[in-house]
Interface confidence: medium
């Protein structure tokens, strides 16, 4: 809503941005606060309890001063005035400093990611060209689910070096398509680590691991827990032998019984010989009966 243009009353012209302004009516703020003064003293606004509608006036003044978008010197000090910005406003900005990003994320801390924040992050990441480690560190600190909100295409711009910033909880809501993109990057990032350390780091990315990597892990006494196993790709688990799964899970193999009706365990059981399943001594049922011939139909389809 436009604030009526009225002359500033005598003696009310603002010499600086200070607490006295909270007692100004909206039209007085419009008439008595110079936009250039506001821009140079933006850092003070955050400490002054302006009302919701007084902030509309201050925003309007900045919009008039910077119709092409605010400079970063102003953006960095927006404070809670940021909550008044629309995604359209933010698309005009060029935010390059991580400090600016942190300052604005701090304002929204504890809330869901708003459209404004999503736009801000998008502008920042696009400006940098890739999601570097420092940025990822910052974003996942404020929004643990951030990584999993990106599309597989966006994730492809994450350099392997950034994977070191990822914590297990950051991947909690990722789907298999996202893990398919992240797993090879993690494998590359952690390739110089020794067996047990490598497994600790790679574990939360294994939902994107292919069969051959799972076979290799089964040779390393990793003792994968059932929660991790249940998140593996079904197509990666199916070709594993009973012996390989037993080695992969170690003492956790007993947990298969409780999961025998759930994927990928259910589908894996259907592919195993019942004889082999019986060697586990867990009472797993549903394997291929003894004496039956197993045909690999996938090979036949590939040939026809």
């Amino acid at each position: 809503r436009e604030v009526e243009k009225t002359a500033c009353p005598s003696g009310k012209k603002a010499r600086e941005i200070d607490e006295s302004l909270i007692f100004y009516k909206k039209w007085e703020l419009e008439a008595c606060v110079d936009a250039a003064l506001l821009a140079t003293q933006m850092d003070r606004v955050n400490a002054i309890p302006f009302t919701y509608e007084q902030l509309d006036v201050l925003k309007h003044k900045l919009d008039e001063l910077y119709p092409q978008g605010y400079p970063e010197s102003v953006i960095q000090h927006l404070g809670y005035l940021f909550l008044k910005m629309s995604p359209e406003d933010i698309r005009k900005w060029n935010v390059t400093s991580l400090e600016t990003l942190k300052a604005l994320l701090e304002v929204n801390k504890g809330h869901e990611m708003s459209p404004q924040v999503a736009t801000l992050i998008d502008r920042f990441v696009k400006g940098r060209g890739q999601l570097d480690k420092d940025t990822l560190d910052t974003l996942t600190a404020f929004y643990p689910g951030y990584l999993c909100s990106l599309s597989p295409e966006e994730l492809s711009s994450v350099p392997p070096s950034s994977i070191w910033a990822v914590r297990p909880q950051d991947l909690d809501t990722c789907d298999p398509r996202q893990l398919d993109v992240l797993y090879p990057k993690a494998r590359l990032a952690f390739q110089n680590m020794n067996g047990s350390e490598y497994f600790v780091k790679i574990q939360s990315f294994l939902g994107g691991a292919p069969t051959e990597d799972l076979k290799a892990l089964s040779q390393q006494n990793v003792s994968m827990d059932l929660a991790t196993f249940m998140k593996l790709r079904t197509d990666a688990v199916l070709p594993l032998t009973v012996a390989e799964v037993q080695k992969l899970l170690g003492p956790h193999v007993e947990g298969l019984k409780a999961e025998e009706r759930h994927r990928p365990v259910r589908d894996w059981i259907l592919r195993q010989r019942q004889d082999d399943l019986d060697t586990l001594g867990l009472g797993l049922q549903g394997g291929i009966p003894n004496g039956y011939l197993v045909l690999d139909l996938s090979m036949q389809e590939a040939l026809s």
């Epitope: 302006f50 009302t51 007084q54």
Partner: nanobody, 119 residues
Framework: QVKLEESGGGLVQPGGSLRLSCAAS????????MAWFRQAPGKEREIVAV????????YYAESVKGRFTISRDNPKNTVYLQMNSLKPEDTAVYYC????????????WGQGTQVTVSS
């Protein structure tokens, strides 16, 4: 319409403490600035403390700086005034107020709670 109800007032000795509460009802006040005003007998109503709608910015009258603290709990629609090191001159009726506009227009008021500082 916003309804404001103050509580927590009473008689206290000089140097003592009180915590005033103001519960808002009728609509959420998360986008409103909240304030405490006071009016001593024979004097004009004066502003004591203000907190903005995010809980970030605060303002205190010079006479209470360092002694009083204003805070808010948006989910509970409540604002508080913690008053420490009370002095006899703090004796007044304390009013809670809310506005989205400015303190000189469109302000909602509570009924007030009496604070008496006396030995």
């Amino acid at each position: 319409q916003v309804k404001l109800e103050e509580s927590g007032g009473g008689l206290v000795q000089p140097g003592g403490s009180l915590r005033l509460s103001c519960a808002a009802s009728g609509r959420t006040v998360s986008a409103y600035n909240m304030a405490w005003f006071r009016q001593a007998p024979g004097k004009e109503r004066e502003i004591v403390a203000v907190i903005n709608w995010t809980g970030g910015g605060t303002y205190y009258a010079e006479s209470v700086k360092g002694r009083f603290t204003i805070s808010r709990d948006n989910p509970k629609n409540t604002v508080y005034l913690q008053m420490n090191s009370l002095k006899p001159e703090d004796t007044a009726v304390y009013y809670c107020a809310a506005t989205r506009t400015s303190w000189t227009e469109n302000t909602y008021w509570g009924q007030g709670t009496q604070v008496t500082v006396s030995s």
